[in-house]
Amino acid sequence: QRLPRMQEDSPLGGGSSGEDDPLGEEDLPSEEDSPREEDPPGEEDLPGEEDLPGEEDLPEVKPKSEEEGSLKLEDLPTVEAPGDPQEPQNNAHRDKEGDDQSHWRYGGDPPWPRVSPACAGRFQSPVDIRPQLAAFCPALRPLELLGFQLPPLPELRLRNNGHSVQLTLPPGLEMALGPGREYRALQLHLHWGAAGRPGSEHTVEGHRFPAEIHVVHLSTAFARVDEALGRPGGLAVLAAFLEEGPEENSAYEQLLSRLEEIAEEGSETQVPGLDISALLPSDFSRYFQYEGSLTTPPCAQGVIWTVFNQTVMLSAKQLHTLSDTLWGPGDSRLQLNFRATQPLNGRVIEASFPAGVDSSPRAAEPVQLNSCLAAGD
């Protein structure tokens, strides 16, 4: 798939035509719900769940050079070749305890709400992001990250926990969503698909990306995760989409090159500290934000999700390594570890930039369907 060329920092609609055009209003799917494909290997559908995740294309990631144009979400084409119908992963996860309902998995029994009732909540994650429906909030300032450039020592624990690969972060990584909204990073993990099948958790206009990184943070108002679970703003996750690009991503290679060591479920290794911010997009000013939940049981709500508009590029080989190295429960490959997109149920996704405004020649007037609810606007 050929990616649209992107003008770094150009306003939406800055291009006159062709590939530089952002998504136009007429590009939106005609129905209320974005085009969907088959169920992913997420949990059993809940009643009324209209937002099932789709999956389409192959992955990609970005080298962080300022000169190079980097893909932005609003530049994605909305017309895509449908992927193969995705069946729930059926090669996986034989629960060792038989009917123990606490052993959740992707794609099959037990239904997640049986594992944790919160998974049937009304404000769950992930969701499909529709930029045209996002509310532009000028009050959403650029994210601030402090202390994310880690020295090689002490080393960090990289673990295959059977659901993902997780890097546990040391104390001292500070992140601010805005004034008085301060957090400490705890860990990061990834979600991915399989060969030829994308595996991001969030989608954009129904488009599923090859993979997604989540950096999980705890509000400084709380000392421990268990105190913060379910409390509004108690946890915050920074999420970025990973895509396929022409070059190897050196930051990600520091982790991906170690995956063979932790191929087995439950295994772990120690890796030198690295620049965690290098795993994220370089543009901290353009993002979408909404309140949702953890995307795995216990699915606790009140989580502030910040999804970067800019994507990160990895090479095809790196994306293959990510999706084809690790093993999960029951001698199954650890693949397609994403949850179905969940209904917004009235939530409005906010954008730090005018994602829904199309000022290109195709639109007679700018379109912005929702207004910002943030205080101070």
């Epitope: 996860h93 629960d95 060792k96 305890e97 123990d100 606490s102 052993h103 959740w104 998995r105 944790s116 673990r159 926990n161 059977g162 659901h163 997780q166 546990t168 705890l186 860990q187 999980v216 705890l218 421990r224 995760v225 268990d226 105190e227 679970l229 946890l235 479920e265 439950g266 795995t296 049981p297 216990p298 999960g328 429960p329």
Partner: nanobody
Framework: QVQLQESGGGLVQAGGSLRLSCAAS???????????VAWYRQAPGEQRELVAV???????KYSDSVKGRFTISRDNAKNTVLLQMNSLKPEDTAVYYC????????WGQGTQVTVSS
Amino acid sequence: QVQLQESGGGLVQAGGSLRLSCAASGNSVNIFRFATVAWYRQAPGEQRELVAVITSAGGTKYSDSVKGRFTISRDNAKNTVLLQMNSLKPEDTAVYYCNADFLQDYWGQGTQVTVSS
């Protein structure tokens, strides 16, 4: 207050057995069953060493030094993880720590295991 409490340590002769228990209490019971739980040990003057891990899905992993002798299991109904230690050797002598990883690490205070020859 979240707590992980280890118990079951003690003095045992080489070749004997012990069963360590890691129990969650307080708020941690809400997350313990979703955590990956590991037993680590630390002998005097040594680095902390991973002994055994059990994931939330029940998958297990052991260090080479205890494979075939130790067994880790979990009882989510009781919010406990057990470490059954058989054929104990003097080199198993250490303080054993329970670690629960759910978004962040929770640690117990440790329990002493001493294996005499």
